[in-house]
């Protein structure tokens, strides 16, 4: 159950998709990736207040226990719910190849 | 790729499975669950230092960008990689039923 999408902390403060521009050097990929030279990395960033985009029952439990024991149980965390695939032109032992990675770019986000 | 399982922060400090004992009241379930009265909630807690139990390529990217831009990109987060199902005896409109929940108890953990 994807719970409430209303952010009580104010617009854009809660768990959502952000885009961060990164070079191959930033990513530590310069020695094995040829293209693209720059990646628009989509990632999940933001707070997960009570029941905001709760991914499942476990996330709801975590919210309840965090409220009771904030020093022991962390709040739910903003992570990808699904991914967009991306192709990289990479160096391999046998030469250059196009390789698709299914778990590279976040597509949407939830709290867990 | 599940990367290194060695925790550089010291034993038990990194992302791993913890058990937290919680009553129905703690969980806010007292009005709809009859049994169990107490749940041994298994959850994922701990730090995610560089490449520790990285769930996928996205987690590796997040680690690299967090190192570069710690104020913009958060570190990867310790979340369930899979779940153990659990049965609850719950109240329904028509009486009592046994309901299995697949996403309630964390089985193992990774960083994402």
């Amino acid at each position: 159950a994807r719970n409430g999408d209303h952010c009580p902390l104010g617009p854009g403060r809660c768990c959502r998709l952000h885009t961060v521009r990164a070079s191959l050097e930033d990513l530590g990929w310069a020695d094995w990736v040829l293209s693209p030279r720059e990646v628009q990395v989509t990632m999940c960033i933001g707070a997960c207040p009570s029941q905001f985009r709760a991914a499942n029952m476990h996330a709801q439990i975590k919210t309840s226990l965090h409220r009771l024991k904030p020093d022991t149980v962390p709040a739910p965390c903003c992570v990808p719910a699904s991914y967009n695939p991306m192709v990289l032109i990479q160096k391999t032992d046998t030469g250059v190849s196009l390789q698709t990675y299914d778990d590279l770019l976040a597509k949407d986000c939830h709290c867990i | 790729a599940r990367n290194g399982d060695h925790c550089p922060l010291g034993p038990g400090r990194c992302c791993r499975l913890h058990t937290v004992r919680a009553s129905l009241e703690d969980l806010g379930w007292a009005d709809w669950v009859l049994s169990p009265r107490e749940v041994q909630v298994t959850m994922c807690i701990g730090a995610c230092p560089s490449q520790f139990r990285a769930a996928n390529m996205h987690a590796q990217i997040k680690t690299s960008l967090h190192r570069l831009k710690p104020d913009t990109v958060p570190a990867p987060c310790c979340v369930p990689a899979s779940y153990n199902p659990m049965v609850l005896i719950q109240k329904t409109d028509t009486g009592v039923s046994l309901q299995t929940y697949d996403d309630l108890l964390a089985k193992d953990c990774h960083c994402i």
Epitope: S35, V87, I89, V96, L98, T100, L105 | -
Partner: antibody
């Protein structure tokens, strides 16, 4: 296994519109960085890049032909289309589609031949 | 448009020889050059990407070199199956452009 196959009318008369289809398998145009390009080659001559379309619907055309070209895609059916209006004998050529990852034509179709004749 | 010039339309060689196909860009294209091989009646096949990186599965007798404006495809120990036409292509800027091709034939 990645494959691409072009299909077209084979023969057209001058001033007609050429409609080409590239049907592919083994990759998806939902993948960031992935595209399909059209390239042509008159018999015994060199290669000329015509157009390409990327996963995000970004379209690029060769300026020398831009006013006559339209590229489009049907991602769910794994097809890319190219229309060339007002064909002339100079458009007689083999037409290829190629998988394009970040501007690299790594795998090409077998080609389809167009003859423009009155 | 960036013009890619392959000055030699034909090159004669013998099996076992070493041959170098050259390509010159009309402006600096960095290492944004690919090479393709086309045999008669077939579609082109990728050989080299980013000026010097062999495409997966391409025999190591094919070597690409160069950057900026001058590029070379070298074939060492030429085999009979290497008799084909070779095209360079730049992907530094649009429109993407090819050289006119160099045909490798037997002496």
């Amino acid at each position: 296994q990645v494959t691409l196959k072009e299909s077209g009318p084979g023969i057209l008369q001058p001033s007609q519109t050429l409609s080409l289809t590239c049907s592919f398998s083994g990759f998806s145009l939902n993948t960031s960085g992935m595209g399909v390009s059209w390239i042509r080659q008159p018999s015994g001559k060199g290669l000329e890049w015509l157009a390409h379309i990327y996963w995000d619907d970004d379209k690029r055309y060769n300026p020398s032909l831009k006013s006559r070209l339209t590229i489009s895609k049907d991602t769910s059916r794994n097809q890319v289309f190219l229309k060339i209006t007002g064909v002339d004998t100079a458009d007689t050529a083999a037409y290829y589609c190629a998988r394009t990852g970040w501007d690299f034509f790594d795998i090409w179709g077998q080609g389809t031949t167009l003859t423009v004749s009155s | 448009d960036i013009v890619m010039t392959q000055s030699q339309k034909f090159m004669s060689t013998s099996v076992g020889d070493r041959v170098s196909v050259t390509c010159k860009a009309s402006q600096n294209v960095g290492s944004n050059v690919a090479w393709y091989q086309q045999k008669p009646g077939q579609s082109p096949k990728a050989l080299i990407y980013s000026a010097s990186y062999r495409y997966s599965g391409v025999p190591d007798r094919f070597t690409g070199s160069g950057s900026g404006t001058d590029f070379t495809l070298t074939i060492t120990n030429v085999q009979s199956e290497d008799l084909a036409e070779y095209f360079c292509q730049q992907y530094k800027s649009y429109p993407l452009t090819f050289g006119a091709g160099t045909k490798l034939e037997l002496k």
